[in-house]
């Protein structure tokens, strides 16, 4: 094949090599950029900056090599449009530093920085940590700081991410209240800070105030939906990013719902309870306190992380006619109490008719399915029961 006369020439099916001396001063308008997976650049003394716009449209890029060139600055967001980048070789350039933000969000298997006049400072603490932890092939490069010795020996005692303290109200917060949160930020070289409020949605009206080092946030007219929602304060400096999340507990009274008993391998009287603080629960059976045993007990479903409502079952293992009756769930917290009742009829007396027993309700036989937590059963009989849809 004839030699390629252009500044950049195809290499393989999805690669590009740019090695003609001094032909590039930016990476705009590279041919076939959208399909490139590999880009090799060498001997480009005029290529001094790598910025966000330079790599726009290189979404498939996996390997980027810029070596023996004049690169002095890589923008913190330079690789925003190349999320698949896994190998980055920037050796033998003029880089004095590289921000932690540059590689944040990438899954770099390899990062090569040897041959750069690195300047040891807290801004390279992240790279020192990669070296300590054996990440990205960094330890093998034995990186040196220009005139300062090995990167590994750089003092780092003062190189910390910002320290955050979020003050939340001590007093009980009620529905409709306004809540003031304050985030105190401490640390060296503070760059940016703010609030992440993505979970709040309609939980409150939000007003931000202040700036570094003290950020204010007013949550006005809060609703009970604010419970279990994260309010996050963040701050960044040249070392890294810190986040602290808090939750505001909004008090509201207990509430309870009961649903018709359903038969699985065992029986379940489904319930939902809500309230902040979480309500205490008590079951009554025909008006008397129900003592929970391995045959009848409260079983909670796994709670959703971002809501206060709890769902569960009063679980009954192989109930008989003596378990037919009125079930009441009482829920109480300091702000109120609630109750709900339901009649449940599991079966006729399977043993005999006894005049002293309550008169049972008759149901048609149904089949059942097995679920975990009970012996795996060999079936050769049809138990009594009732199949009910929960509406």
């Amino acid at each position: 094949a004839a030699p390629c006369p252009d500044a950049c020439c195809p290499h393989g099916s999805s690669g590009l090599r740019c090695t003609r001396d001094g032909a590039l001063d930016s990476l705009h308008h590279l041919p076939g950029a959208e399909n490139l997976t590999e880009l090799y650049i060498e001997n480009q003394q005029h290529l001094q900056h790598l910025e966000l716009r330079d790599l726009r449209g290189l979404g498939e890029l996996r390997n980027l090599t810029i070596v023996k060139s004049g690169l002095r600055f890589v923008a913190p967001d330079a690789f925003h449009f190349t999320p698949r980048l896994s190998r980055l070789n920037l050796s033998f350039n003029a880089l004095e530093s590289l921000s932690w933000k540059t590689v944040q969000g990438l899954s770099l298997q390899e990062l090569v920085l040897s041959g750069n006049p690195l300047h040891c400072s807290c801004a390279l603490r992240w790279l020192q940590r990669w070296e300590e932890e054996g990440l990205g092939g960094v330890p093998e490069q034995k990186l040196q700081c220009h005139g300062q010795g090995p990167l590994a020996h750089m003092p780092n005692a003062s190189c910390g991410v910002p320290t955050l303290k979020v003050q939340v109200p001590n007093a009980s917060v009620d529905v409709g209240d306004d809540v003031l949160l304050r985030c105190q930020v401490e640390g060296r070289g503070l760059e940016q800070a703010g609030w992440i409020l993505t979970e709040l949605e309609q939980s409150a009206t939000v007003m931000k105030s202040g700036g570094l080092p003290s950020l204010g946030l007013t949550l006005a007219n809060v609703t009970s939906d604010l419970n279990r929602k994260n309010v996050t304060c963040w701050a960044e400096n040249d070392v890294g990013r810190a986040e602290v999340s808090v939750q505001v507990n909004v008090s509201f009274p207990a509430s309870v719902q009961l649903h018709t008993a359903v038969e699985m391998h065992h029986w379940c009287i489904p319930f939902s309870v809500d309230g902040q603080p979480a309500p205490s629960l008590r079951w009554l059976f025909n008006g008397s306190v129900l003592n929970e045993t391995s045959f009848i007990f409260t079983e909670f479903l796994e709670p959703a992380a971002n809501e206060t409502v709890r769902h569960g079952c009063l679980r009954l293992n192989q109930p008989t006619h003596v378990n037919n009756g009125n079930y009441t769930l009482l829920a109480a917290n300091p702000f109120g109490q609630a109750s709900a009742s339901i009649m449940a009829a599991f079966m006729d007396n399977p043993f005999e008719f006894n005049p002293e027993d309550p008169i049972p309700v008759s149901f048609s036989p149904v089949d059942t399915n097995s679920t975990s937590g009970d012996p795996v059963e060999k079936k050769d009989e049809t138990p009594f029961g009732v199949s009910v849809a929960v509406g």
Epitope: N291, E292, T293, S294, F295, I296, F297, T298, E299, R315, N317, Q318, T320, H321, V322, P350, F351, E352, N354, S372, G373, D374, P375, D380, E381, P383, F384
Partner: antibody, heavy 115, light 108 residues
Framework: EVQLQESGPGLVKPSGTLSLTCAVS?????????WTWVRQPPGKGLEWIGE???????NYNPSLKSRVTISVDKSKNQFSLKLSSVTAADTAVYYC????????WGQGTLVTVSS | SSELTQDPAVSVALGQTVRITCQGG??????ASWYQQKPGQAPVLVIY???KRPSGIPDRFSGSSSGNTASLTITGAQAEDEADYYC???????????FGGGTKLTVL
């Protein structure tokens, strides 16, 4: 498959406290099951001691209630039995099992009460 | 009463049917479970609930109940069925469990 393994001293002095632990493997002690202790004196029948749920609910045999404590340690996936003021009549093989059906049992551990 | 009563010993000819019974007031209200125990071993659940058999238990084992009596029936007893059999159920209060005294089954 769920497995249970009892452990603890095989010899306890009269008036002392018997302490046993049951390690649960192959399943979580925080599942929808209760866990129970049963004992069997040499040459005699089975006696239910008590049961516990991971949320802390407990029930005890009325005849032993004043001397029995059953507790659960979710972090270690195990539950324990303490029986105080023991006498020779408490000499038995002690079993742990999964309630309510006792469908899984430990192999049992003999505890002798003797000075 | 919080008691379950079993016959101390029962025998059966090989291949024949045998019924082991368990009596108690709580059996009017609750199902019995049945356990097989061989010497030096932990008990094994054979029947629970309304004639339910755990996986691995042969179908010659079945359970039934009438009045204050629960029964374990072995249809076509085998030599390996020789063991002690215990019933249990909830006590009448429903708040604790009780065992029968056990029945020693001999297969002749």
């Amino acid at each position: 498959e769920v497995q249970l393994q009892e452990s603890g001293p095989g010899l306890v002095k009269p008036s002392g406290t018997l302490s046993l632990t049951c390690a649960v493997s192959g399943g979580s002690i925080s599942s929808s099951n209760w866990w129970t202790w049963v004992r069997q004196p040499p040459g005699k029948g089975l006696e239910w001691i008590g049961e516990i749920y991971h949320r802390g609910n407990r029930n005890y045999n009325p005849s032993l209630k004043s001397r029995v404590t059953i507790s659960v340690d979710k972090s270690k996936n195990q539950f324990s039995l303490k029986l105080s003021s023991v006498t020779a009549a408490d000499t038995a093989v002690y079993y742990c099992a999964r309630a309510p059906w006792f469908d899984y049992w430990g192999q049992g551990t003999l505890v002798t009460v003797s000075s | 009463s919080s008691e379950l009563t079993q016959d101390p010993a029962v025998s059966v000819a090989l291949g024949q049917t045998v019924r082991i019974t368990c009596q108690g007031g709580s059996l009017r209200s609750y199902y019995a479970s049945w356990y097989q125990q061989k010497p030096g071993q932990a008990p094994v659940l054979v029947i629970y609930g309304k004639n339910k058999r755990p996986s691995g238990i042969p179908d010659r084992f079945s359970g039934s109940s009438s009045g204050n009596t629960a029964s374990l029936t072995i249809t076509g007893a085998q030599a390996e069925d020789e063991a002690d059999y215990y019933c249990n159920s909830q006590a009448s209060s429903g708040n604790h469990l009780i065992f029968g005294g056990g029945t020693k089954l001999t297969v002749l």
